[in-house]
Structures are given as C-alpha cells and as structure tokens.
Interface confidence: low
C-alpha cells in the first residue's frame, strides 16, 4: 500500500553508506520551506542491507542488484510516490572500497558501475555512487554530529532536549570507527595544523571553522584484527596461534590466503610453511592490549606531536562524540554510560576477555558467533586506539561521549554528506528569508 502525499510541504533524501562490512540506507526528511535552518533535517528510516559490503561483490557483481533491492523497496514504501522523482539518492563508499581500489582500480570501478546501474532503475533522482575520501568521511561525520547537536545554530531554542547539554557553541570533535578505517576530527584550540593534508576550512552559518581531520586506513576494527593476526603469526612457532584477544576455549581456523588478501596485511606478509592456522583463545586483556600497541608505530614523528605512524595530531580539545563501531561495541559491552571511568572500562574488559567462550556463548545466545567472538578484541582495540593512539587520558576520557543517535538520527557521515550535496548548509547565517544558494561547503 503506497503512502498518500503528505499535506505539509516536505522533502526527502536517501544516502547509502557502503561500508566495508555492510551497507546501510538512510532516509532523511525536512520541511521544504526551512531548508537553510539548522537542525531541521531528521532521519526517518534506516535499512541495513543483508549481506557483506559491496567490495565483497567483486567476483559476483551480477548479485549487487538484488542485494540492494530490499532496502530500495523499503525506501519506495516510506517515501510518498508523489515525492519519488524529486528525492535525491547518493551512495558513498568508504574504506572497504578504498582498499579494493588500491588493489585494482578496474575492479573497484566495475563494482561502482553495477551499483550505479542498479540504483538508476529506481524511480528516485539518483545522483551517483562514489568512493568518498577519508578526509570527507571525517569532515561529514563532524558536520553531522554538530548539526544534530545544534552547534551551528545561533538560536538555542532546543538545547534543553539535546542529550549532551553543554549550552555553548563549542563544537564536538568526531571519532568514527568503521571496519576498515577510523577517523578523528575536531577544532584544535589556537593550534596551527602543521600538516596541510589534515586541515579543513569551513564557513558555516556565518562562522569560520579550522578543522583537523585524519582517516587511518587499515585501522578500522576488522582490518586492525587482520593486521594483528598477520603480525602475530609471523612469530608463531607452528600453525597454532594462541591469541589473548579471544576468549579461553575459542577456536577458529584461518586460511593464510584470506589473511593476506587485504592490502592492510602486506607489511607483515611472509611465506609460511602452512596454508591454514588455528586461533586458540587465551583471553588475556593485558597481553591483547600489548599486541595491539605493536600496530601503532610511535617511534617516528616529524611534527610537534603525532598520533601514530608519523601522523600529526594536535592536542585534544573539548568534547568528542564517538560513534559507529565505537558506539556499537561499547554498547554491547554496556560501557557507554558517562559515569563509567576509563579505569572501570579497563577493569570490565579484563573480566570480559577472561570469560570462557562456552560461557560467553550461553550468556549471549542469539548473537552471531562471528561478531560475539570479536568483542574482546574490539573493546581492547578501542581502548588502545583512544588512549595510546589518540592520547586520551583517564581524565579526558570523560569528554568522550559514546553516541548512537542524536535526536533520532544516527551519528555518522551520511547526514553531513547529504546536507552538503543538497546545499543545505549555507556559508552565511540565513536571514528570515533564505539567502540565494551561492557559497556552500
């Protein structure tokens, strides 16, 4: 049954987030006459596409059409038919496709081409599919959370209902963790951004922002795990890898060919005397943490201060919203509360990782084993990345807010991407009648 056209004058937009592990479709809605106001766009639907990320379809591109069908049909149901032709559809692919492009530009293009042809078959205004840069991913995530928190607004009319009550116009930093990359984006305090690649200048709603951003490719949680396994199997004496990042009693066979499939493990690649190895969990947080730290090269820094791998990072400033996998993992571990100190989080992780695998499976029946088995690693990785990678401390930990949604909209890059592409973030503060659309991000 098709929805009837709404009496009020509203607009819709669709963004597909083609991540490394899965694709999600977001539908946004806003009042047409308030396009230039801040905080008026909100998410009305999220549809998670069944199956893996689009980069996994490289050998079976003919299956992409049906892969996207269910969520695109859902969009057809949610958005009134009268609005279909005016509704823009954007697909942004992130680090999974960046990695595929590193391996083969031709294969990445082929996947995107089939995606575009599939999406063009729907009655919406398809605007294209592209691989967004890590810098864009960081920037749009930062725009999203600050837009939803009302940080760009001079009017404080709805601050009372914003969950992170700071009652000032200081922007939040953005911490985004995906499967294949992680982004850190914030406005440093009076600090020169020493590396031009990490500097962004925005003028939004009449205010200038000098923003630092960096995307660490291969440091999303899934690729970080592949890196760690590739590093650790180098020094294993045989095809048994006793791994502290998995629960005691956990066992899994890994193909060496799968391990070396990703460009992220190339630096650890070596000829091994076996085709497969078995992970045997021993569940030790401290050892897991130590193993993860070996992925961060902190011995080299050509700037006044670095995160890791020689990448400039200014001193941290203000509050941060940590979203995507930062949120999903910490939510699963029940560690998202503002009241949980960093010491408490570490303590809980030690206990969690030490729990036997059989016990964990019983406690979390209904959670897919592949995901369940990796929470010990993912939780430990998040702590390692935030503390040793980005230099948060026990004191500054309280400035990290693990955010899933703000005002009903998911925190992530998609909303910021759509706001920019639909010209809904004016450079100048709109007057009572909106300015002509001239200068945008």
């Amino acid at each position: 049954t098709q929805n009837k056209a709404l009496p009020e004058n509203v607009k819709y937009g669709i963004v597909l987030d083609a991540g490394s592990s899965h694709t999600s479709l977001y539908i946004y809605k806003w009042p047409a006459e308030k396009e230039n106001d801040t905080g008026v766009v909100h998410q009305v639907e999220e549809c998670r596409v069944k199956g893996p990320g689009i980069s996994k379809f490289v050998q079976k591109v003919n299956e992409i059409g049906i892969y996207l069908t269910d969520c695109m049909e859902r969009a057809r149901e949610v958005i009134p038919r009268s609005q279909h032709q005016e509704t823009p559809v954007y697909l942004g692919a992130t680090a999974g496709m960046r990695l595929l492009r590193m391996e083969s530009e031709e294969l990445a293009d082929r996947v995107l081409d089939v995606v575009e042809r599939s999406l063009s078959n729907y009655p919406f205004d398809f605007q294209g599919a592209r691989i967004i840069t890590g810098q864009e991913e960081g920037a749009y995530g930062w725009i999203t959370i600050n837009y939803l928190l009302g940080k760009f607004s001079q009017k404080t009319r709805w601050f009372s209902i914003v969950p992170y009550e700071t009652n000032n116009q200081e922007t939040f930093g953005a911490l985004d963790l995906g499967g294949a990359s992680t982004q850190v984006t914030f406005v440093p305090q009076n600090q020169t951004i020493e590396s031009p690649d990490n500097a962004l200048q925005f003028r939004l709603y009449g205010k200038d922002y000098n923003v630092y951003t960096h995307s660490f490719l291969c440091y999303g949680k899934d690729q970080a795990l592949w890196q760690k396994l590739a590093k650790d199997i180098q020094v294993a004496s045989n095809e048994i890898l006793r791994d502290p990042c998995f629960h005691p009693g956990y066992k899994k066979v890994v193909n060496v060919s799968d391990l070396y499939k990703t460009p992220c493990t190339k630096r650890f690649e070596m000829t091994l005397p076996f085709q497969q190895f078995e992970i045997q969990g021993i569940g030790n947080y401290q050892q897991c943490h130590q193993s993860i730290l070996e992925l961060f090269n902190t011995s080299y820094c050509p700037y006044s201060q670095c995160a890791f791998n020689g990448i400039f990072l200014p001193p941290l400033q203000g509050d941060f919203g940590a979203f995507s996998a930062f949120y999903f993992v910490m939510k699963f571990l029940n560690l998202t509360s503002e009241k949980v100190s960093q010491e408490k989080v570490t303590e809980m992780m030690k206990k969690f990782c030490a729990q036997p695998w059989e016990e964990i499976k019983t406690s979390y029946a209904g959670v897919k084993e592949k995901y369940l088995s990796e929470y010990c690693f993912s939780g430990t990785y998040i702590l390692s990345l935030l503390l040793q990678g980005y230099h948060f401390t026990a004191d500054s930990w309280e400035h990290i807010h693990f955010i899933g949604k703000i005002q009903g909209s998911d925190a992530g890059w998609t909303l910021g991407y759509m706001l920019n592409l639909t010209n809904m973030i004016p450079a100048e503060q709109p007057l009572s009648t909106p300015l002509s659309h001239s200068t945008y991000v």
Epitope: K50, G51, N62, E63, I66, T69
Partner: antibody
Framework: QVQLVQSGAEVKKPGASVKVSCKVS????????MHWVRQAPGKGLEWMGR????????KYAEKFKNRVTMTSDTSTNTVYMELSSLRSEDTAVYYC????????????WGQGTMVTVSS | DIVLTQSPALAVSPGQRATITCRTN??????????MNWYQQKPGQPPKLLIY???SLASGVPARFSGSGSGTDFTLTINPVEANDTANYYC????????FGGGTKVEIK
C-alpha cells in the same frame, strides 16, 4: 554448523490455531530472512511467507495473508509461524528455511513439522 | 505473482541424461541476474538445494547436476542419472519473494 530444529507434530481440530517454532543454532536469525514452506501429503511445496527478524518485517503469500502470523524472538534465536482457522486442507508438513540475501543459496531447512487437522 | 510450470513426470534409465523443464511467467531475470533455483526432495526429507541463480552449483552437490536458461525458460539436467536420483525436483524463483513449480517426479527405470 547451522541447524534448524522445529517443534513436534501437532493434531488440531478444524477452526483451531497452531503455532510451530523453529529454533536456529550456530548463527543468529538476524543474519537471515526466515521463510515458511508447507507440503500437503503427496503434493508440492507451497511458500507461505517470510520474516526478517532484524526488523520484524513480514511478507505473506496472498493465500495466507489473513490467517498466518510470523514472529521472531532474537533472545532465543527462534522464529514462529501461527496459522489460524485451520481446515482439513491445512494438513501438511510445515518447513522453516533460511535465506541470507535474496537470490543467494537458501542455506538451511528445518526437519519439518507435521500438522494434522481432523475432527 | 510469478507462476512456475514444470513438466510433471519423467522416467529415465541409469547412465542416461534426464532433462527437467520449468517455465516462468513473467521473467525471473532482474538487473542481469536470474533468480531461479532447483531443489531435490526425497520422501520424508526436507528439500535440498541443487542449483541457485539458474546455473550455480550448490556446495556439496555432484557435478552431474547442472542448470541452464534465462528469462522464462529453464532446464535442470542430470547426466548421467544414477539410481539414487529418484526423487521429486522443484524449480523455485526468488526474484520476487518465493514461488515453487508443481514438481517433477523422476523415476529411474
């Protein structure tokens, strides 16, 4: 290894309802679309509908729309199919089956549940 | 709704080729992919997937089974037939939810 285990055989009177369960082990039901298919004695396979446990969304075959209800419980990793206003023609073996992405392999089937409708 | 029509029965000698046909109305092609699957069912057992996406062999299925066709006309071929291939064979479309054909009873002479 993924397994689908269905509830036991049922004998029902006409006009009654039956609720068949399908418990999945070895993977989360949220990874799949869960379908129900029935087969009357000596007859062919008949698709009844599916549920997406991730979003609790259902799609039913036109024939069963007014009589069937499919539900899921992610805490027990179980899906259910309830058929109401039973008649003798509903006597059949009822199967649950998984589908990961539409068009990919249908991975697993339950062993079947015999439902007999007789006065 | 998509309607699938199968040939009802077939008797074939061991070592010979068995060809089962299935016609769909309308097409089960969608954006270049063909959503046709074939199942084998033996008495008292659930159906077993043989072929998916018209011609892809499901894991663990012998290479004696093959699928072909596109659009509206499809064929499941068993070559050579063996004695334990006696069963009912069903075509199924998954382009728009699911529909099964009426089944083809294959007997080995």
């Amino acid at each position: 290894q993924v397994q689908l285990v269905q509830s036991g055989a049922e004998v029902k009177k006409p006009g009654a309802s039956v609720k068949v369960s399908c418990k999945v082990s070895g993977d989360s039901i949220t990874a799949y679309f869960m379908h129900w298919v029935r087969q009357a004695p000596g007859k062919g396979l008949e698709w009844m509908g599916r549920i997406d446990p991730d979003h609790e969304r259902t799609k039913y075959a036109e024939k069963f729309k007014n009589r069937v209800t499919m539900t899921s419980d992610t805490s027990t990793n179980t899906v259910y199919m309830e058929l109401s206003s039973l008649r003798s023609e509903d006597t059949a073996v009822y199967y649950c089956a998984t589908e990961r992405v539409p068009g990919f392999e249908t991975d697993y089937w339950g062993q079947g549940t015999m439902v007999t409708v007789s006065s | 709704d998509i309607v699938l029509t199968q040939s009802p029965a077939l008797a074939v000698s061991p070592g010979q080729r068995a060809t089962i046909t299935c016609r769909t109305n309308p097409t089960v092609d969608h954006y270049g992919t063909t959503y046709m699957n074939w199942y084998q069912q033996k008495p008292g057992q659930p159906p077993k997937l043989l072929i998916y996406l018209a011609s892809s062999l499901a894991s663990g299925v012998p290479a004696r089974f093959s699928g072909s066709g596109s659009g509206t006309d499809f064929t499941l071929t068993i070559n050579p037939v063996e004695a334990n291939d006696t069963a009912n064979y069903y075509c199924q479309q998954s382009r728009n939810l699911w529909t099964f054909g009426g089944g083809t009873k294959v007997e080995i002479k």
